[in-house]
Interface confidence: low
Amino acid sequence: EVEKTACPSGKKAREIDESLIFYKKWELEACVDAALLATQMDRVNAIPFTYEQLDVLKHKLDELYPQGYPESVIQHLGYLFLKMSPEDIRKWNVTSLETLKALLEVNKGHEMSPQVATLIDRFVKGRGQLDKDTLDTLTAFYPGYLCSLSPEELSSVPPSSIWAVRPQDLDTCDPRQLDVLYPKARLAFQNMNGSEYFVKIQSFLGGAPTEDLKALSQQNVSMDLATFMKLRTDAVLPLTVAEVQKLLGPHVEGLKAEERHRPVRDWILRQRQDDLDTLGLGLQGGIPNGYLVLDLSMQEALS
């Protein structure tokens, strides 16, 4: 808390300009009118204030707007946004996409902070729906935002929002989300050639059906084990040994290390042991020669 002190003679700020960087904290508190600050917020960002000075400016705005800042101030917060707490942001009513973009720009290149998460939550709730423009803005800044949406919300995502998604942005997506995202990615990338297509679609394959995996096995894609382990079990089970061998290419040897984990474990249980032996990896647990292939539901119960 900054003490209330009178402004020294001749130091009263008539406008927000660079001369203020030489003011001590108490002088800023005493000599800068909060209403003046609010109307000239756009200038603050261009002035190299110290963190301590920014704290004083924030304090002045908090006093002027105890119920929450108006959008005219919010849009021009710039780096002062980084000083806001989630509690501050919950008081705001942000309706303009331009305001959202301006604040996301401040945090660009960094992970989504609690402040940004709160801001997005307030914005989306304020709008009442996640429209295309909002979603496109959010995925442009935070492609990982997709994984925070429910499958129902994801169903309204246009294929065009998929282009910027990086592999790490899908790390937190669960299979139900990938089920929704995969067809959109397939649509967005379908005109790419084989190797480029695989690079782009790889992160989304946790939502791929069996027929698509079979098609990929014909394209020498050399899927790595990490990707294979994220595939839907029900999509992997119908694949033949030959198809998995083609799908993984040189990575097929990694199956041995994963033979006790899903989906490899469940897949092994569905294959004839003779076929597994052709891989030369020592995989055990396949169907002995001469036995019928068990019904899938019964197989699941046994495993």
């Epitope: 294929p159 005109n191 480029e196």
Partner: antibody, heavy 121, light 108 residues
Framework: QVQLVQSGAEVKKPGESLKISCKGS????????IGWVRQMPGKGLEWMGI????????QYSPSFQGQVTISADKSISTAYLQWSSLKASDTAMYYC??????????????WGQGTLVTVSS | DIVLTQSPATLSLSPGERATLSCRAS???????LAWYQQKPGQAPRLLIY???KRATGVPARFSGSGSGTDFTLTISSLEPEDFATYYC?????????FGQGTKVEIK
């Protein structure tokens, strides 16, 4: 062969509306993004915006947002660029072009021949 | 927006000479998402190079692209008469995609 054919040159007065077209052939029109690029007389290339013909989802450059409208009719493999009220500064050559791979993830691999729009009173 | 600055603005060379065109980005263009186009007077641009170094279909081997990050180069190993034109670089990594201002290669 793969080509984009644009509508002919237009001469208009300020304040008039205009819609120019770009028809794709020789490939699956709905599988590729179509972009529009402006080239003012004697100047360089400026990216205006893009459309995904399947659902007509558009994305504009901030410089052109609200100034033009991009649309498409997938049934006739045609994309459009339109103005509701032309200005003299809209005088330029306008090119449509196809994105080779994905949205911004690709270069413009096929170009239309261009449509010259002249706005003069 | 990423600003692309091409240099030189004009390059005066004779047929058979080597042309080196530069394109510098104001910030890193990741994943080599940079293309080069050739435009002759009265014609539409034509894609030469994409992915910073991959030649587009039908582009002669004398055209090559290189570079990464913020510095990219288009090289024409031996100029043919039909190569005299204006060349533009374009980044398609960041939104919105942007073009350089162009380099005109003219006959000396």
């Amino acid at each position: 062969q793969v080509q984009l054919v644009q509508s002919g040159a237009e001469v208009k007065k300020p304040g008039e509306s205009l819609k120019i077209s770009c028809k794709g052939s020789g490939y699956s029109f709905t599988n590729y993004w179509i972009g529009w690029v402006r080239q003012m007389p004697g100047k360089g290339l400026e990216w205006m915006g893009i459309i995904w013909p399947i659902d007509s989802f558009t994305q504009y450059s901030p410089s052109f947002q609200g100034q033009v409208t991009i649309s498409a009719d997938k049934s006739i493999s045609t994309a459009y660029l339109q103005w509701s009220s032309l200005k003299a500064s809209d005088t330029a050559m306008y090119y449509c072009a196809r994105y080779g791979h994905g949205m911004y993830g690709g270069a413009l691999d096929v170009w239309g021949q261009g449509t010259l729009v002249t706005v003069s009173s | 927006d990423i600003v692309l600055t091409q240099s030189p603005a004009t390059l005066s060379l004779s047929p058979g000479e080597r042309a080196t065109l530069s394109c510098r980005a104001s910030q890193s263009v990741r994943s080599s998402r940079l293309a080069w186009y050739q435009q002759k007077p009265g014609q539409a641009p034509r894609l030469l190079i994409y992915g910073a170094s991959k030649r587009a279909t039908g582009v002669p081997a004398r055209f090559s692209g290189s570079g990464s990050g913020t510095d990219f180069t288009l090289t024409i190993s031996s100029l043919e008469p039909e190569d005299f034109a204006t060349y533009y670089c374009q980044q398609y990594y960041d939104f919105p995609p942007t073009f350089g201002q162009g380099t005109k290669v003219e006959i000396k």
